[in-house]
Every structure is written in C-alpha cells, then in structure tokens.
Interface confidence: low
Amino acid sequence: ITQQDLAPQQRVAPQQKRSSPSEGLCPPGHHISEDGRDCISCKYGQDYSTHWNDLLFCLRCTRCDSGEVELSPCTTTRNTVCQCEEGTFREEDSPEMCRKCRTGCPRGMVKVGDCTPWSDIECVHKESGTKHSGEAPAVEETVTSSPGTPASPCS
C-alpha cells in the first residue's frame, strides 16, 4: 500500500483486518498477533509499520509539535511528516526543536541563503566570501532581512 492508494474515507480507522503471516512476517501496515498466526492491520492515523515485520504492535504515529506544520499525515505504512514553521529551522545538532532563524547578518557580511525549515540564513563576508557561523549578532550589528514572521521554537 502506498500513501496514494489510501482513499480519503480510510482516515476513519476501520476495523482491524487480519491476514496470515508470510514466512513469519507481516506486510507494511500490519503487525503480527501474539500467537504469530495472524497479521493485524495498523489503525489509520494512529499507528503504522513501514516494512515487512514481526512487530507485536504497530509504531505510534508522530504528532507534530506546536511550531511545526504537518506536511503529510500518518498512514498505516508511513509516519507523519512534520516541518518547522516559516521563520524557524531544525538543526542537525538539535533535531528535537525548531529554532528561530536570524533576522540578518553581522556588519560586513551579506546574506547568501534564506531561512528554510532545514537551515538558518547563510551569511558570507563581503570581501572574502567566507561563510559565517556562530551566534546571532547583536541587533545593532545586523543587516536586516525579512525571513517572514518568526515563530516560537517547538516544544
């Protein structure tokens, strides 16, 4: 089953369907019963499984935090996809929360990259073109830009 195959009416969790395991494994969108005899469907919008598996129960769907937007809903075979709101981004070093993008670059630097859900604005030195990394500059040192309305970090 792919996400595209799921009809809109399946958003309402249907009765859990059963089928038989194949070589001890159940297909994506299912988990195995305690006795190993049945494959039981995950509940649409509540839990999921992505691979052939022998899980005793499906994996719980992620709920997007405040400060995140839901790009795609949880299906029986795919977890929810969440993304930081406009004006915030998620760093690799701290993936658990969305952080506010800087509003501008330090003096002597120019912006070469916008705020995206995956990265802060990117600044380079005017002369050398060297990238700048570090803390957000003090307000009086900034060259302002308009990255959109800043949002609160995700909780």
């Epitope: 001890g24 195995i32 305690e34 190993g36 839990d47 598996n53 022998d54 899980l55 005793l56 129960f57 994996l59 719980r60």
Partner: nanobody, 122 residues
Framework: EVQLVESGGGLVQPGGSLRLSCAAS????????MGWYRQAPGKQRELVAE???????NYADSEKSRFTISRDNAKRTVNLQMNSLKPEDTAVYYC????????????????WGQGTQVTVSS
Amino acid sequence: EVQLVESGGGLVQPGGSLRLSCAASGSIDSINNMGWYRQAPGKQRELVAEITPRGRTNYADSEKSRFTISRDNAKRTVNLQMNSLKPEDTAVYYCNAEVRERGTSWYRPDYWGQGTQVTVSS
C-alpha cells in the same frame, strides 16, 4: 512503572568473553524490540544489537561475528554474549526495551537500564 536491570559487566582481558543479561519487570503488557547499546567515554550511545519478539536480530557491523543477542519472551530477559573482546569494546552497556505498559495502547521506545560497565584491558 517499568524497570530494566542489567548484570554481567566487569573487567576482562582482551580476547576474553562476557555475558550481559537484562531483565524487564513492572507493569508490562508486551515488549516489542529489545536491544543493547553502548556508550564509550566522550562518544555517543550506539546500537550494539537488537532482537525482535520473534527472534529476528540486527547487529552493528563490527560486532556481527563476535556478539550474539538472545531473548526469553516468557522471562522478559535479553542477553548479549560477547566473545573475542577488544579494548575498543570498553564502554557502559545499556539495555533498551520498547514496552507497552498495562492499560495503554502504545509501546514506548525509551525504557533504559542504568547501564553496566564493561572494561577490556590487560
């Protein structure tokens, strides 16, 4: 409440063996995957091996030939047999379990033991 208690760590010479055990207890309805992770000083916690309820295993590449994970579903235990130990295996070893507590519908993947120290040194 759910508890995971590890045992079996200690000091061993290079080339030696150890058997780690972990027992889960408490308000448990069902246990999904169980596994062993380790954390060496100054390094991130990393997966060593994990095992599904029906015995399917997954090992970190470097440990595949030397380590063996096993579990007893009835006793809610998971073991890690470690052979041909090397100094780089020195770390704190943690047991992990994905547990569904009684009265709940979901497993939680974040149950951890306190850890047991394994030191490989001559």
